[in-house]
């Protein structure tokens, strides 16, 4: 399964789209910045097998897709860019799912690392809570956009490490 190469390209496209989605100057939102506690250790490709790493990537993309598929998100972003971004994420999810199935069939390794999946879910819960507390304000969404770009960058780096392992 040659996931990392195709997935990295998709991730880069998603990052570019997310960069283009900015609607207000982030410099008007400096006071709204927040530490969401990105679980960076979950993006350390050395600590688990390829299948488990792929399942963490899948969870990250899935949660990002869910976050940007809400009604509140639709109201916050320019529709055509949001649709392109969501389509890119959806394509990545399909690639990841196919890859996990292939890896499990070939390697027989466990499908996921429960602790890592839970860490990613809690991270997105913190993001959702922040948006709720900030009443989905434009600045709150701008802060979240930067944070998701950061997390997507981390997952891109994990993919690079996976490629070196292959």
């Amino acid at each position: 399964c040659d996931l990392p190469q195709t997935h990295s390209l998709g991730n880069r496209r998603a990052l570019i789209l997310l960069a283009q989605m900015g609607r207000i100057s982030p410099f008007s939102c400096l006071k709204d910045r927040h530490d969401f506690g990105l679980p960076q250790e979950e993006f350390d490709g050395n600590q688990f097998q390829k299948t488990q790493a792929i399942s963490v990537l899948h969870e990250m993309i899935q949660q990002t897709f869910n976050l940007f598929s809400t009604e509140d998100s639709s109201a916050a972003w320019e529709q055509s860019l949001l649709e392109k971004f969501s389509t890119e994420l959806y394509q990545q999810l399909n690639n990841l799912e196919a890859c996990v199935i292939q890896e499990v069939w070939m390697e027989g390794t466990p499908l996921m690392n429960e602790d890592s999946i839970l860490a990613v879910r809690k991270y997105f819960q913190r993001i959702t809570l922040y948006l709720t507390e900030k009443k989905y304000s434009p600045c709150a969404w701008e802060v979240v956009r930067a944070e998701i770009m950061r997390s997507l960058s981390f997952s891109t780096n994990l993919q690079k490490r996976l490629r070196r392992k292959d």
Epitope: A19, Q20, F27, C29, K31, R33, H34, D35
Partner: antibody, heavy 120, light 111 residues
Framework: QVQLQESGTVLARPGASVKMSCKAS????????MHWVKQRPGQGLEWIGV????????TYNQKFKDKAKLTAVTSANTAYMELSSLTNEDSAVYFC?????????????WGQGTTVTVSS | DIVLTQSPASLAVSLGQRATISCRAS??????????MHWYQQKPGQTPKLLIY???NLESGVPARFSGSGSGTDFTLNIHPVEEEDAATYYC?????????FGSGTKLEIK
């Protein structure tokens, strides 16, 4: 690899204007903010402002609002800074620097600097 | 504007010893879990190089002998053990609010 190539040394008269360039390569130019920083000889660093090449959005240090104008041409992957009404105080090295880590606003890659000398 | 006061202005440290540089902000640069203070190294005739971001995060490729700490208004850069190649001027920079500002710099000399 990421590179920021700045224009060469500039000698200008007081009251004149100068426009310096910063050509970016090795990364997606339109998706990173670009900062500009001033350093006077033997002195510290001063943040001038920042531009987002993707849409031309700019934010300035109020101190430089009437002094510096930041622009970018995406087709050329180049950012520009124009300094107007030059005085001796504007004699300095000017760096373009790429924004890093999104909204942490640190600077990872720096151009080699453009030296501006204002003299009559 | 937030003023960053660095001390000392210069220091001389013996090879292998510890160098400690302080940066004090006139107003807190920490919000909601992050401290928006960063450290750079500038060698003569060179461009500044990012060492530490968000007060304590070591930039990729920077030797582990560099470390940063602090929150609110008081921040510290430590270098231990100091090596010859560490002779440079060190600047702190905040990104807590506009305008971003730099400290006046600390010149490190190796004895």
């Amino acid at each position: 690899q990421v590179q920021l190539q700045e224009s060469g040394t500039v000698l200008a008269r007081p009251g004149a204007s100068v426009k310096m360039s910063c050509k970016a390569s090795g990364y997606s130019f339109t998706t990173y903010w670009m900062h500009w920083v001033k350093q006077r000889p033997g002195q510290g660093l001063e943040w001038i402002g920042v531009i987002y090449p993707g849409n031309g959005d700019t934010t300035y240090n109020q101190k430089f609002k009437d002094k510096a104008k930041l622009t970018a041409v995406t087709s050329a992957n180049t950012a520009y800074m124009e300094l107007s009404s030059l005085t001796n105080e504007d004699s300095a090295v000017y760096f373009c620097t790429r924004n890093y880590k999104y909204d942490y606003y640190t600077m990872d890659y720096w151009g080699q600097g453009t030296t501006v000398t204002v003299s009559s | 504007d937030i003023v960053l006061t660095q001390s000392p202005a210069s220091l001389a440290v013996s090879l292998g010893q510890r160098a400690t540089i302080s940066c004090r902000a006139s107003k807190s640069v920490s919000t909601s879990g992050h401290s928006y203070m960063h450290w750079y190294q500038q060698k003569p005739g060179q461009t500044p190089k990012l060492l530490i971001y968000l007060a304590s995060n070591l930039e990729s490729g920077v030797p582990a002998r560099f470390s940063g700490s602090g929150s609110g208004t008081d921040f510290t850069l430590n270098i231990h053990p100091v090596e010859e190649e560490d002779a440079a001027t060190y600047y702190c920079q905040h990104s807590g609010e506009l305008p971003f500002t730099f400290g006046s710099g600390t010149k490190l000399e190796i004895k």
